[in-house]
C-alpha cells in the first residue's frame, strides 16, 4: 500500500467554497449561517478552495498554531447553570436527567441485544461454512492455516466463544490436538476484534469522532495481530503455551465446577430469543464431519422436546461388536445386541419471529444482519447523542479526569494495570469482550476516554474473556474438562504474553501508534476503513487459506517474497525517518514510485467515481441510515433531505481546517496521509436535541 500518500494541489475555483487557513473565519458569500470563531481572528486570511466534502484532496496551509487531532474535545455546556435555575427548572432538569439515563440504558440494552443478534445473523450466513473450515485435515500440520481458520470462523460466526467451543469439542473428540488448536485460538482472538471495528464504522459521520473511534477500535486489532506475529513463530518453535498449560492442567486435580455466571445474558436473552434462536450444535457437528448436520437448519424450531430413552435390538456383524457379552444373542443367522436409543419427541415450538417461516438460513441471516446493523447504528447514534448532551461542562471534566488521569507520582505506572484489571472485570461481568469493547468505542469517539486509556482497558478485556472461558472449562463434563481447560489456559497465557510484549514499556506500545496512524488515514479517506476491514479480516486470511490448501511450497513461494517486500519497505521507511543521509538521494523519499503506489489520492479518485452513482441515491436516506450512507459515499452533502446530514454539511462548510505540520508528528508510524487531515475540531454530526 501507499507508504506516503501525498496531498494534491487544489486549483482555485470561483464556484467552490472558500476557506481560510489555520483558524480564520471562513468567507462564504452565499452563506448566512456562520459561526464566529474567536481563535486567531487576527491572522491574515489565506483563501483557498474547499472541495466537496467527499473529495479529500485539499491543499491546506500550515496553521500558525497546531491542534493535536488526538486531543480530547472540550464538551462545552451551553445550558443554564444549576445555581441559576429556579425550582421548576431544577425539577425539570432532574427529570430530564433521569429520562436521559433511562433512554441511555434502553439504547445500551438494544445496542447489546443487536450485537447478540448480529452474531446470530453471522452464524446463519456463514456458520456452516465456518464449520467446514474446521473439517480441513491440513490444520494439524499447518499452524498458519489454523490461524487463518480461527480468524475466518470467528469473523463468520461473530463469536470467539463459539469458535473456541468447536475447537474444544474437536480436541476432546481427538479430532484435533492441543498443539494444532493453539493457532486457531490465536486466530479466534484476532477475529473477535472485528465487532468493535464494525461499531466504529457507525461513527463515520464526524471525522474527528471517527478518527478517535476507529483508532480506539483498531488498537485491539493491532494488539492481536502483532501478538500473533511474534507469538505464533515462538509457539511453533518452542511450544511454550502447550507445555506451560499442560503442566498446569496436570499439576491440579480439578473437579467439575459450576457454569460461568451469565450476567448480561440474563437481561438480554428474554428479548433476543424472541427474535431468533439458534441450534449452535449444528456448527460443531459440521466441524466434526457429521454429514447429517450439513442439511440441518441452524434456526431452532422446537424448544421443548421430550427425550425418551429406550433399548432396541440391533444386528451386529459379529459378537465382538456387541454392547457387552451379556447383551449379545443370535437368532441363528444374525448376531443381535441391545442398543440404548434416544427418541426425541417434539412437544412445543420456540417462540421467535422466524419459527414458522421455514426460510433458508441464508435468508434469515441476511434479514437479521441488515436489521441488527440498522438497530446497532441507530442505538449507537442515540447513545452518542445522549452522552453528548449529558457529558458537558463540569460532568465531562470530572469523568474525563477520573478515567484518563494517572495516579500521582511514583505510582503513575500502576494506572494502566488498574485499567487492565477494570477491563478484565467488566468483561467478566458482561461475559463478552465484543460487548465491552463495542461499548467502549463510542466513548472513545466522543472523547470521554483517550486511546491511551482505552488500550489497557481493551487488553484487560482480552484477559476477561479468557477467565470466562476458564470458568466455562471447569464446568465441562469429565471427558472435555482437560482439553477445554488447557485450551482456555492457552488463550489466557497468549493474551498475557501479548500484554508483556506490547504494554509494560511505553516504547513497545506499538498498537496505539499504529491505530492512531490508521485513524488518521481513515478519517481522511473514510473508504479506507472498509478497505482495511475487508483486507485484514477477509482477504488476507482467505488468501493464506487458499495458498495453504495448495500446499507448503506454494505458500512459501508466495509468502516469502511478500514478507521480504514488507520488511524491505519497513526498513526503508525507518531509515527515511531516522537517518535519511544513509540512503541514496533517490531512496530518501518515495517519489521514485508512481503516485498510485505511494499515495491514496489516486485511489480516492477511483473510489469517489465508483461511489458517485450512490451519491444521488443517498438523498432519501433516513436519519439512522445517514451515517452508513456517508460511509459509502463519503458525501454528507448528498443526503440533503436527511437532517443529520444537512447539519453535517453546514458544519463542515463553516469550519476551519488546521493541520499538524510534518515536524509535529512525533510518531513515525503515523502516515503523512494524516498531515492533510481535517481537524479534531471538526463539527459534530449530530442532529438537534432529543
Amino acid at each position: 500500500m501507499a507508504p506516503w500518500p501525498e496531498l494534491g494541489d487544489a486549483q482555485p475555483n470561483p464556484d467552490k467554497y472558500l476557506e481560510g487557513a489555520a483558524g480564520q473565519q471562513p468567507t462564504a458569500p452565499d452563506k448566512s449561517k456562520e459561526t464566529n470563531k474567536t481563535d486567531n481572528t487576527e491572522a491574515p486570511v489565506t483563501k483557498i478552495e474547499l472541495l466537496p466534502s467527499y473529495s479529500t484532496a485539499t491543499l491546506i496551509d500550515e496553521p500558525t498554531e497546531v491542534d493535536d487531532p488526538w486531543n480530547l474535545p472540550t464538551l462545552q455546556d451551553s445550558g443554564i447553570k444549576w445555581s441559576e435555575r429556579d425550582t421548576k427548572g431544577k425539577i425539570l432538569c432532574f427529570f430530564q436527567g433521569i429520562g436521559r439515563l433511562i433512554l441511555l440504558l434502553g439504547f445500551l440494552y438494544f445496542f447489546v441485544c443487536s450485537l447478540d443478534i448480529l452474531s446470530s445473523a453471522f452464524q446463519l450466513v456463514g456458520g456452516k461454512m465456518a464449520g467446514q473450515f474446521f473439517s480441513n485435515s491440513s490444520i494439524m500440520s499447518n499452524p498458519l492455516l489454523g490461524l487463518v481458520i480461527g480468524v475466518l470462523v470467528t469473523v463468520l460466526v461473530q463469536s470467539s466463544s463459539t469458535s473456541t467451543s468447536i475447537v474444544v469439542s474437536m480436541v476432546s473428540s481427538s479430532l484435533l490436538t492441543v498443539r494444532a488448536a493453539i493457532p486457531i485460538i490465536m486466530g479466534a482472538n484476532i477475529g473477535t476484534s472485528i465487532t468493535n471495528t464494525i461499531v466504529a464504522l457507525m461513527q463515520v459521520g464526524d471525522r474527528s469522532e471517527f478518527r478517535r473511534a476507529f483508532a480506539g477500535a483498531t488498537v485491539h486489532d493491532f494488539f492481536n495481530w502483532l501478538s500473533v506475529l511474534v507469538l505464533l513463530p515462538v509457539e511453533v518453535a518452542t511450544h511454550y503455551l502447550e507445555i506451560i498449560t499442560q503442566l498446569i492442567v496436570e499439576s491440579f486435580h480439578f473437579k467439575n465446577g459450576e457454569d460461568a455466571p451469565d450476567l448480561l445474558k440474563v437481561i438480554t436473552k428474554p428479548f433476543t430469543k424472541l427474535i431468533v434462536q439458534l441450534d449452535k450444535k449444528v456448527i460443531s457437528q459440521i466441524a466434526m464431519n457429521d454429514e447429517k448436520a450439513k442439511n440441518k437448519s441452524l434456526v431452532k424450531i422446537w424448544c421443548k422436546t421430550f427425550t425418551n430413552k429406550t433399548q432396541i435390538n440391533v444386528t451386529v456383524p459379529s459378537t465382538a461388536n456387541c454392547t457387552s457379552p451379556s447383551l449379545c444373542w443370535t437368532d441363528g443367522i444374525q448376531n443381535w445386541t441391545m442398543k440404548n436409543v434416544t427418541y426425541k419427541e417434539n412437544i412445543a415450538k420456540c417462540q421467535h419471529i422466524f419459527v414458522n417461516f421455514h426460510l433458508p438460513d441464508l435468508a434469515v441471516g441476511t434479514i437479521l444482519l441488515i436489521l441488527s446493523l440498522l438497530v446497532l447504528c441507530g442505538c449507537l447514534i442515540m447513545i452518542v447523542k445522549i452522552l453528548g448532551s449529558v457529558l458537558k461542562g463540569q460532568v465531562a471534566t470530572v469523568i474525563k479526569k477520573t478515567i484518563n488521569t494517572d495516579f500521582p507520582f511514583p505510582f503513575a505506572w500502576l494506572t494502566g494495570y488498574l485499567a487492565i484489571l477494570v477491563g478484565a472485570g467488566m468483561t467478566f461481568i458482561v461475559q463478552s469482550s465484543s460487548v465491552f469493547t463495542s461499548a467502549l468505542t463510542p466513548l472513545i469517539g466522543i472523547g470521554v476516554i483517550t486511546i491511551e486509556r482505552a488500550y489497557p482497558l481493551t487488553l484487560g478485556s482480552n484477559i476477561g474473556t479468557t477467565t470466562t472461558a476458564i470458568l466455562a472449562a471447569l464446568a465441562s463434563p469429565g471427558n472435555a474438562l482437560r482439553s477445554s481447560l488447557q485450551i482456555a489456559l492457552c488463550h489466557f497465557f497468549f493474551n498475557i504474553s501479548g500484554i508483556l510484549l506490547w504494554y509494560p514499556i511505553p516504547f513497545t506500545r506499538l498498537p496505539i501508534r499504529m491505530a492512531k496512524g490508521l485513524g488518521n488515514i481513515s478519517a481522511k479517506y473514510r473508504w479506507f476503513a472498509v478497505f482495511y476491514l475487508i483486507i485484514f479480516f477477509f482477504l488476507i486470511p482467505l488468501t493464506v487459506f487458499g495458498l495453504s490448501l495448495a500446499g507448503w511450497r506454494v505458500l512459501v513461494g508466495v509468502g516469502v517474497p511478500v514478507v521480504f517486500i514488507i520488511i524491505l519497505v519497513l526498513c526503508l521507511r525507518l531509515l527515511q525517518s531516522r537517518c535519511p543521509r544513509v540512503l541514496p538521494k533517490k531512496l530518501q523519499n518515495w517519489n521514485f514510485l508512481p503516485l498510485w503506489m505511494r499515495s491514496l489520492k489516486p485511489w480516492d479518485a477511483v473510489v469517489s467515481k465508483f461511489t458517485g452513482c450512490f451519491q444521488m441515491r443517498c438523498c432519501c436516506c433516513c436519519r439512522v441510515c445517514c451515517r452508513a450512507c456517508c460511509l459509502l459515499c463519503d458525501c454528507p452533502k448528498c443526503c440533503r433531505c436527511s437532517k443529520c446530514c444537512e447539519d453535517l454539511e453546514e458544519a463542515q462548510e463553516g469550519q476551519d481546517v488546521p493541520v499538524k505540520a510534518p515536524e509535529t508528528f512525533d510518531n513515525i508510524t503515523i502516515s503523512r496521509e494524516a498531515q492533510g487531515e481535517v481537524p479534531a475540531s471538526d463539527s459534530k454530526t449530530e442532529c438537534t436535541a432529543l
Partner: antibody
Framework: QVQLVQSGAEVKKPGASVKVSCKAS????????MHWVRQAPGQGLEWMGA????????SYNQKFKGRVTMTRDTSTSTVYMELSSLRSEDTAVYYC?????????????WGQGTLVTVSS | DIQMTQSPSSLSTSVGDRVTITCKAS??????VAWYQQKPGQSPKLLIY???TRHTGVPDRFSGSGSGTDFTLIIRSLQPEDVATYFC?????????FGGGTKVEIK
C-alpha cells in the same frame, strides 16, 4: 394355525445324500427363520443350521459345514435341508423348526420330524 | 462352542412336588436361554425363552431364572402331564447348543 409338515422317513447308504423338505403354513413364511435340529436315538438335540426364507441367508453349525445345504422355495413355502456324505452316525430324527419370536434363537414351532436311517 | 451342562440327567418325584432343573453354560450367555419340553415320541415344545419369559399357552407352574452362566427351570407343582425330557438351549452365540436333557418321571 402354524403348521410345519416334513417329508417322510428315508433310508440311505453311507456316502449318499438326503434331502428333507419342510412345508410351512399358517404364517408369513418369508418373515421367520427356519432352523434344522436333529436328534439321534436316545440322545439330545443338535442344531444344524438356519435359513432366513426372505433372503435365503443361511448359517450353519461348523460341525456340518460343507455337508449341509439349506435352501428355500418361496412359491411353495418350503424349506429344504440336504445332508451329503452320510455316515452311520447321521442316523437321527431331523426336525425343521420355525422361530416366530422375532430376533431370538428360541424355536417355538416344530415339524413332526423325519427319520433318516443311514445303513449299509 | 458354548457347552450347556444340565443336571440332574434324570429325576423321579411325586405329583405336586417342586422340581428344579439346573443348566450351566461354559461362558456368559446373558439371558439368552430357552427351555423345551419333549414328551416321548413327540417333537420338542418351547416352554420358556429369555430365561424367564413363558411362551404362550405354557402353565404358570413353569418358571425360569438365572443369568450369565447359571440357569434354573422350576416346576412348582409337578403334574402327571409334565412327565417328559426337558432341554435347555443357549442362543447367545452360533452355533446354538442344547443341554443333554433332564428326564422327569413320577414315582
Amino acid at each position: 394355525q402354524v403348521q410345519l409338515v416334513q417329508s417322510g422317513a428315508e433310508v440311505k447308504k453311507p456316502g449318499a445324500s438326503v434331502k428333507v423338505s419342510c412345508k410351512a403354513s399358517g404364517y408369513t413364511f418369508i418373515t421367520y427363520n427356519m432352523h434344522w435340529v436333529r436328534q439321534a436315538p436316545g440322545q439330545g438335540l443338535e442344531w444344524m443350521g438356519a435359513i432366513y426364507p426372505g433372503s435365503g441367508d443361511t448359517s450353519y453349525n461348523q460341525k456340518f459345514k460343507g455337508r449341509v445345504t439349506m435352501t428355500r422355495d418361496t412359491s411353495t413355502s418350503t424349506v429344504y435341508m440336504e445332508l451329503s456324505s452320510l455316515r452311520s452316525e447321521d442316523t437321527a430324527v431331523y426336525y425343521c423348526a420355525s422361530s416366530t419370536i422375532i430376533t431370538t434363537g428360541a424355536v417355538d414351532y416344530w415339524g413332526q420330524g423325519t427319520l433318516v436311517t443311514v445303513s449299509s | 462352542d458354548i457347552q450347556m451342562t444340565q443336571s440332574p440327567s434324570s429325576l423321579s418325584t411325586s405329583v405336586g412336588d417342586r422340581v428344579t432343573i439346573t443348566c450351566k453354560a461354559s461362558q456368559d450367555v446373558g439371558t439368552a436361554v430357552a427351555w423345551y419340553q419333549q414328551k416321548p415320541g413327540q417333537s420338542p415344545k418351547l416352554l420358556i425363552y429369555w430365561t424367564s419369559t413363558r411362551h404362550t399357552g405354557v402353565p404358570d407352574r413353569f418358571s425360569g431364572s438365572g443369568s450369565g452362566t447359571d440357569f434354573t427351570l422350576i416346576i412348582r407343582s409337578l403334574q402327571p402331564e409334565d412327565v417328559a425330557t426337558y432341554f435347555c438351549q443357549q442362543y447367545s452365540r452360533i452355533p446354538l447348543t442344547f443341554g443333554g436333557g433332564t428326564k422327569v418321571e413320577i414315582k
